[in-house]
Structures are given as structure tokens and as C-alpha cells.
Amino acid sequence: ERVPGTTPCPRGSSWSADLDKCMDCASCRARPHSDFCLGCTAAPPAPFRLLWP
């Protein structure tokens, strides 16, 4: 049984205390009330750095 904070969830997922397992953050778009969505970033990181002149 995973102790929260000891082993991070895979990228794109977050720990659910209600299910005691990592859950896919992609589902938070459909159901944002899920407890694990608090641990999901609001938006994925940009795939490249924006360079300004």
C-alpha cells in the first residue's frame, strides 16, 4: 500500500486518497470534483520554450 508522498504517481496522474491509488489526470476535464484533481496541474507544460526577440 502506497504511503502518499513517498512514491510519486506517474506523470499525468495524481494520488486519490478516496481510491488509494494513482488516477489519470485526463479524467479531470470531465469530472473536476474528483479528489485527485487537486494534484493535477491546470494545464500541461508547453512543449517548447517561447523565445522572445
Epitope: D18, L19, D20, H33, S34
Partner: antibody, heavy 120, light 108 residues
């Protein structure tokens, strides 16, 4: 065969306490979230409480918050509901149910229920 | 809490009839909608989950459809054992799951 068997119901006076049990068999109990649902005589279904597989996370309906406590003993394959400060409106058949392995999506097996009657 | 409203509250039908029960949510719940059957003195039984997925062991005459706020449970050809009360349940706004008030299917 999956089985959930509730016990502990009965007649209790207002303000009294009861502890319900739900004995699970036919499946590995520890990975599953569980919940209690009640049904007042002649009425519909009302969700009461939810507990995570480890027991570390619990949730309650507003109508029972602060009075009821859900818990589980995974070594005994048993779910509990401690009910304190009981009121007449708590009179109902109480069912335990097994959750699926995704987030709160459905409850696929239910016990036969145990009747709690709160009356003086 | 999200309110679930079923219609009709009761209906009379004959064996072989096609029966449709509707469930409306007070706000969008995507496809997080389940249907249960309950017979008198018995526990509820899961029929349909995620709006349209048939639970294992449930006869194929039962089907579910809908998304957002409007959902339907259809029994294509009513059988004697189908006379019961049916409940919808939303699992979108967790943990406060809520049930519809029920639809009683009676013999005409």
C-alpha cells in the same frame, strides 16, 4: 460468489446508538471502496457514507455528518457504521455496497440490508 | 447537491411492452449515470453503469443512453421478472452521490 451480509440493526430510542456491520466474502475486500446507503420505509435510496480501500478517507451525507462514523477492518473483511445520536428520521433499511475500482463510478454488489428503527 | 429527477414516478405495462424511463440531472453530469433495479424487500441491483454500459449478467433487453443532463433506461421487451422499481444515480459530483426518486413498473 460475492456476498455482503449486514447485521446490527434493531430498535433503538431517540438519542441512542447502534453499530452496524457488513461482512464481506467471495472477493478480496481490501482493494475496494465501500459505502452505506439507506432506504426509509416506502421511500427511495439515500447515500449515507463512503470509505476508501485503506480506510484513510471517509465521506458523509450532510444528514449524518458528526453523528455517524464509517470504518473498516480489512483483516476481518468487515465494514462498520457507528451511529450515534439517532433520530426518528434515521429509521431505514441500511445497505452496504461495494464500489468499483474507478472513482465513485458505480456500486456493483449490495447486501440484503438491516433494519434500524428509531422510536420511543 | 445535484438533483436527479425521474419520470414517470410509476407506470403500468404488459409483458412484451417496450418501456422507457427517463432521468434528468439538475446540471450536466457527463456520462456518470448508473441505473439500478430493486424488487420489494430486496437490495438494489446494478443494471447499467456509465450511462450505457451493461453490467455483467444483466439481460440485453436492458439498455441505457444519454449524456449531459438527460438519460434513458429502456427495456425492449418487458418480462415478468422486470416488474420492480428502477433508480438512477449520478456519480459526477463526488462524494455527494444522489439517486433519483425511483420509477415503479407495475403490471397493467
Amino acid at each position: 460468489e460475492v456476498q455482503l451480509l449486514e447485521s446490527g440493526g434493531g430498535l433503538v430510542q431517540p438519542g441512542g446508538s447502534l453499530r452496524l456491520s457488513c461482512a464481506a466474502s467471495g472477493f478480496t475486500f481490501s482493494p475496494y471502496p465501500m459505502m452505506w446507503v439507506r432506504q426509509a420505509p416506502g421511500k427511495g435510496l439515500e447515500w449515507v457514507s463512503y470509505i476508501s480501500p485503506s480506510g484513510g478517507s471517509t465521506h458523509y451525507a450532510d444528514s449524518v455528518k458528526g453523528r455517524f462514523t464509517i470504518s473498516r477492518d480489512n483483516s476481518k473483511n468487515t465494514l462498520y457504521l457507528q451511529m450515534n445520536s439517532l433520530r426518528a428520521e434515521d429509521t431505514a433499511v441500511y445497505y452496504c455496497a461495494r464500489g468499483g475500482d474507478t472513482y465513485f463510478d458505480y456500486f456493483d454488489y449490495w447486501g440484503q440490508g438491516t433494519l434500524v428503527t428509531v422510536s420511543s | 447537491d445535484i438533483q436527479m429527477t425521474q419520470s414517470p414516478s410509476s407506470l403500468s405495462a404488459s409483458v412484451g411492452d417496450r418501456v422507457t424511463i427517463t432521468c434528468r440531472a439538475s446540471q450536466s453530469i457527463s456520462s456518470y449515470l448508473n441505473w439500478y433495479q430493486q424488487k420489494p424487500g430486496k437490495a438494489p441491483k446494478l443494471l447499467i453503469y456509465a450511462a450505457s454500459s451493461l453490467q455483467s449478467g444483466v439481460p440485453s433487453r436492458f439498455s441505457g443512453s444519454g449524456s449531459g443532463t438527460d438519460f434513458t433506461l429502456t427495456i425492449s421487451s418487458l418480462q415478468p421478472e422486470d416488474f420492480a422499481t428502477y433508480y438512477c444515480q449520478q456519480s459526477y459530483s463526488t462524494p455527494g452521490i444522489t439517486f433519483g426518486q425511483g420509477t415503479k413498473v407495475e403490471i397493467k
